[in-house]
């Protein structure tokens, strides 16, 4: 739902977006996902920040916690206990890195309408969550995990190694937790809550990377985070599981790494629970093209656990990096030994398949010329799947629905029909046992949120329409977005063109490139979206292209591996190749053309400005990775191997942005950063600076005291006021 | 109030049998391990089964091992001990006791008296 | 099996006195899961301290446990009329839980 295009004759009403109303929000969406309890139940906070639980089948609604309460204690989250006894309240929210943050944590008794007194929670906790059944806690303070067997009994200490940059136990170091769960937590309650199963990261030999934080003290404090760059030592992973019944019986037992892994340095990428008694563990070679899913089970004459060679899964690239972003998870079915999983087919599509025994003996589920892209729920007779299949458009999404309880298996698509126009990129949320679910979609039209019936797929109700922005929008001129296909070369170019509103293909328009462009990414999607560049091409006039080239996702892996030990190589090249093919269109003024990226896309807008191709007259490269050897070791080293001579060093070296700081000399080039940059480090910034100033060539820069990778709150409007302003002046457009 | 109160305990001769019972109120019973400890007369304590708040594991200590069974009902809120082939050693008072994480003991009933005699 | 050994067998002080109780264990109890208990004629015992050093609800701020390893100590701090009883030390750490022997604690 495009807010409909009004004739010219009401023009005049209509106005432009601006720069202000993308600052404030004014045109930012809600989305709706239940917070499933049951099969039929969810809560919800409501508007006057009620918890109020829902009941599908009944009808009716009440409030489990009041306002009152949770203002009582400032709290901003909430969690409720399976049996329903207790809600811990979150407050004191103290954001750490991209997931993780401490907080304090209030446990309020909804029998007697009172917080538990006793034994409190210490302060600050780093993670806290409920068991799957009754009212047990875990929580991690101080890098130690503590069990609770109640809210208000005394803490059972289960680990005690734990020190800040050191030993992290249920919870992830920072590149775990950035590049390889990606989570705040690492510790999973078995379905019953009888086990307890943690990784413990050991960080005592990574080197740390240190930079200032200023603060407004008299001197500026140090970071310091244990981060193993490209090549350097890596943290060392254990996982254990306790029994949370009697944890001190025989305390913490080690799961074992299966021996191909353990030959060399490896890494733990997921842990999925099959039963009480049976996990699920999925291990990578640091070369990260091999990895073994390992099924154990638990021995009760030894209280151990046996993880037999025979249950063991090998999966394997031949032409890249292991899975897609990440390795695929397995979803287990109902008899707890064969599940379904998304890897390459024969052809170098991901696909869902399905194991029973062996890997090699894996029943293929779906297939075609597109990609599966994430398995929501199996159930007895149905499995819930998501891909990009429906009229060959990879940037959209789907839900389908397979039989399984049928043969053959029928698919039907649950949602390709049901609002065309408006919705063609879905997500999904299932109650247990998918008896309910809740769509939410996220364009291209205004994004909607609705409860089906997960029998018929009929649909229940409206959760979220966005009427008040949809009112919003009917005076403004929104620009016209488009998404086509380039061929060229055997390669599919997809782009996103957000076009002016009165666009006119005889005209000449500036062109701006926005790029992103790192392995496994997608920039062109059919979403909504009201941001810097809708008022970009609304008030001002541009066109704005975002180009999926190669080492982008979800259209088969020749695509996708092509970039595999050679970033910063074609990711440009099809940048550059799109935008030549969009200068033969004929409205591109070619001597007004830019491009603009964050983090990977600040790296290729970056090498793309010097390239030396006389494309661009200007760019901007925000918080930018500038040579591999700075960056992560984790995300590098999957698409790079190791920085080392006898593997992939010469790349690296001829990969970097310093290297072409000559080219430099003819654009006009932007360079920004945020000095308290976590993830990708101010280091990156820095040299490329130094570089530029080496080679004599002019550039502006703009730095963020203290702030990190997403230069956020007042910095987000300096950012892109300062951006507009660039880019007006390379445009020559008048302020 | 926690309440933990112990009975069946008696006289008994050795190589007999008895069934002890413990009943608990003021807390959620299913939420919890359980254990009995022994304490001979005069002497020190001595741990000698536990259980899972579900009761799906139970554990022994190697004297009782083969002889005592340890069971428990949620839905009565009753925690028992069953006692076959009892010795003269068996002789002291049997104490209930809310067991911590398979850790400490805390609170305990006031304990039942088995004598192991002929 | 761990064995304590707890020391001394019987301790006489005064109301007033500070009281240290010793446990030593015959092998390292591990991540300090000592627990102490005090048990009065004719009634059960009675939790005081768990994990070597936590009090556990209700006990006055007298008594306080220290130690890890193979040495674990009980304190308290000002002896009162009602502390005069026997205590236990009991470790978790290691699978048959055992108890200490006792110390009696009694008015000079």
């Known amino acids: 739902l495009r807010p409909s295009r009004v004739h010219n004759s009401e023009e005049n009403t209509m106005r432009a977006l601006t720069l202000k109303d993308i600052l404030n929000g004014t045109f930012s969406y809600k989305t709706f996902f239940p917070n499933w309890i049951s099969g039929q139940e969810y809560l919800h906070q409501s508007a006057d920040n009620n918890i109020v639980l829902y009941n599908i089948e009944t009808g009716q609604s009440y409030t489990i916690l009041s306002n009152r309460t949770m203002k009582s204690v400032n709290a901003s989250n909430y969690g409720l206990s399976p049996d329903r006894q207790f809600v811990y309240l979150e407050s004191d929210y103290s954001k750490l890195w991209r997931y993780s943050y401490t907080a304090t944590y209030y446990i309020y008794d909804l029998s007697n309408g009172e917080f538990v007194r006793g034994n409190e929670l210490p302060r600050p906790i780093q993670y806290l969550c409920w068991s799957p059944v009754g009212s047990k806690l875990a929580y991690v303070y101080q890098n130690n995990i503590y069990l609770k067997q109640r809210p208000g009994d005394p803490p059972f200490q289960i680990t005690f190694n734990g020190r800040e940059n050191k030993i992290f136990n249920g919870i992830p170091d920072w590149v775990y937790e950035e590049e390889m769960l990606p989570t705040k937590y690492a510790l999973w309650w078995s379905p019953n809550g009888k086990f307890l199963a943690y990784a413990e990261f050991n960080d005592k030999d990574i080197p740390v990377i240190a930079y200032s934080y200023y603060g407004d003290e008299q001197y500026p404090r140090t970071i310091n985070i244990p981060y193993p760059k490209a090549g350097a030592k890596n943290p060392v992973v254990r996982i254990f599981i306790i029994d949370t019944t009697y944890p001190a019986y025989v305390g913490p037992q080690e799961v074992p790494v299966p021996a191909m892994i353990a030959s060399s340095d490896y890494y733990f990428s997921w842990l999925t629970w099959v039963t009480d008694e049976r996990v699920c563990l999925q291990w990578l070679k640091r070369v990260q093209n091999v990895s073994v899913l390992s099924i154990c089970d638990f021995r009760e004459d030894w209280q151990t656990w046996d993880c037999p060679k025979t249950q063991e899964h090998i999966e394997e690239s031949r032409t890249g990096w292991a899975g897609g972003f990440f390795v695929s998870r397995p979803v287990f079915s109902y008899d707890a030994i064969s599940y379904y999983k998304i890897f390459s087919d024969k052809d170098g599509y991901k696909h869902i398949h399905y194991i029973k025994d062996t890997v090699e003996n894996a029943i293929q589920i779906t297939s075609g010329k597109w990609e599966a892209i994430n398995i929501f729920r199996v159930t007895q007779d149905s499995l819930f799947y998501s891909s990009n299949e429906f009229e060959e458009y990879p940037g959209r999404r789907n839900i389908y629905r397979i039989s399984i309880g049928s043969y053959p298996p029928s698919k039907k698509c649950v949602t390709c029909h049901l609002r065309k126009e408006r919705c063609q990129y879905y997500t999904a949320s299932f109650s247990d046992y998918a008896k309910y679910y809740a769509l939410v979609c996220y364009g291209p039209g205004i994004p909607i949120s609705t409860l089906h019936d997960g029998r018929t797929d009929q649909e229940i109700k409206i959760l979220e329409e966005n009427k008040e922005l949809e009112n919003a929008l009917k005076n403004i001129q929104l620009p016209k977005e488009e998404i086509k296909k380039l061929e060229v070369d055997e390669i599919t170019l997809w782009y996103k063109m957000i076009l002016p509103p009165q666009f006119d293909r005889s005209k000449k328009y500036p062109l701006l490139i926005q790029v992103y462009g790192g392995p496994c990414s997608q920039s062109v999607r059919s979403v909504f979206a009201v941001n810097w560049i809708s008022y970009l091409a609304s008030k001002e006039g541009m066109v704005i292209a975002l180009v999926d080239g190669r080492g982008t996702a979800f259209q088969g892996d020749k695509l996708l591996y092509a970039v595999y030990r050679k970033l910063g190589v074609y990711e440009v090249e099809d940048q550059i190749t799109a935008v030549r093919k969009f200068i033969e269109m004929g409205f591109i003024d070619e001597k007004r053309i830019a491009i603009w990226g964050w983090s990977y896309g600040g790296y290729v807008s970056s090498l793309a400005l010097a390239s030396g191709t006389g494309l661009f007259k200007c760019g901007i490269a925000v918080a930018p990775v500038s040579s591999w050897e700075y960056y992560a070791s984790v995300y590098t080293e999957r698409f790079m191997g190791l920085p080392t001579k006898d593997d992939n060093l010469e790349h690296y070296k001829n990969s970097t942005v310093m290297a072409r700081a000559e080219y430099f000399r003819n654009v006009d080039y932007l360079l920004i950063h945020g000095t308290a940059d976590d993830n990708v480090h101010f280091q990156n910034s820095a040299q490329i600076a130094k570089a530029l100033v080496n080679a004599q060539v002019d550039f502006q820069a703009m730095w963020y005291s203290d702030q990190n990778h997403g230069l956020s709150g007042l910095s987000t409007n300096h950012l892109y006021t300062h951006m507009t302003h660039f880019l007006k002046q390379c445009f020559s457009l008048s302020d | 109030e926690v309440q933990l109160l112990e009975s069946g305990g008696g006289l008994v001769q050795p190589g007999g049998s008895l069934r002890l019972s413990c009943a608990a109120s003021g807390f959620t019973f299913s939420s919890y391990a359980m254990s009995w400890v022994r304490q001979a007369p005069g002497k020190g304590l001595e741990w000698v089964s536990g259980i899972s708040e579900g009761g799906g594991s139970t554990y022994y200590a190697d004297s009782v091992k083969g002889r005592f069974t340890i069971s428990r009902d949620n839905s009565k809120n009753t925690l028992y001990l069953q006692m076959n082939s009892l010795r003269a050693e068996d002789t002291a008072v049997y104490y209930c006791a809310k067991d911590y994480y398979g850790g400490w003991f805390d609170p305990w009933g006031r304990g039942t008296l088995v004598t192991v005699s002929s | 099996e761990i064995v304590l050994t707890q020391s001394p067998g019987t301790l006489s002080l005064s109301p007033g006195e500070r009281a240290t109780l010793s446990c030593r264990a015959s092998q390292s109890v591990s991540s300090s899961y000592l627990a102490w208990y005090q048990q009065k004629p004719g009634q059960a015992p009675r939790l005081l301290i768990y994990?070597?050093?936590s009090r556990a609800t209700g006990i006055p701020d007298r008594f306080s446990g220290s130690g890890s390893g193979t040495d674990f100590t009980l304190t308290i701090s000002r002896l009162e009329p009602e502390d005069f009883a026997v205590y236990y030390c009991?470790?978790?750490?290691?699978?048959?839980?055992?108890f200490g022997q006792g110390t009696r604690l009694e008015i000079k």
């Open positions: 009991q470790q978790y750490g290691s699978s048959p839980r055992t």
């Open positions: 994990g070597a050093s």
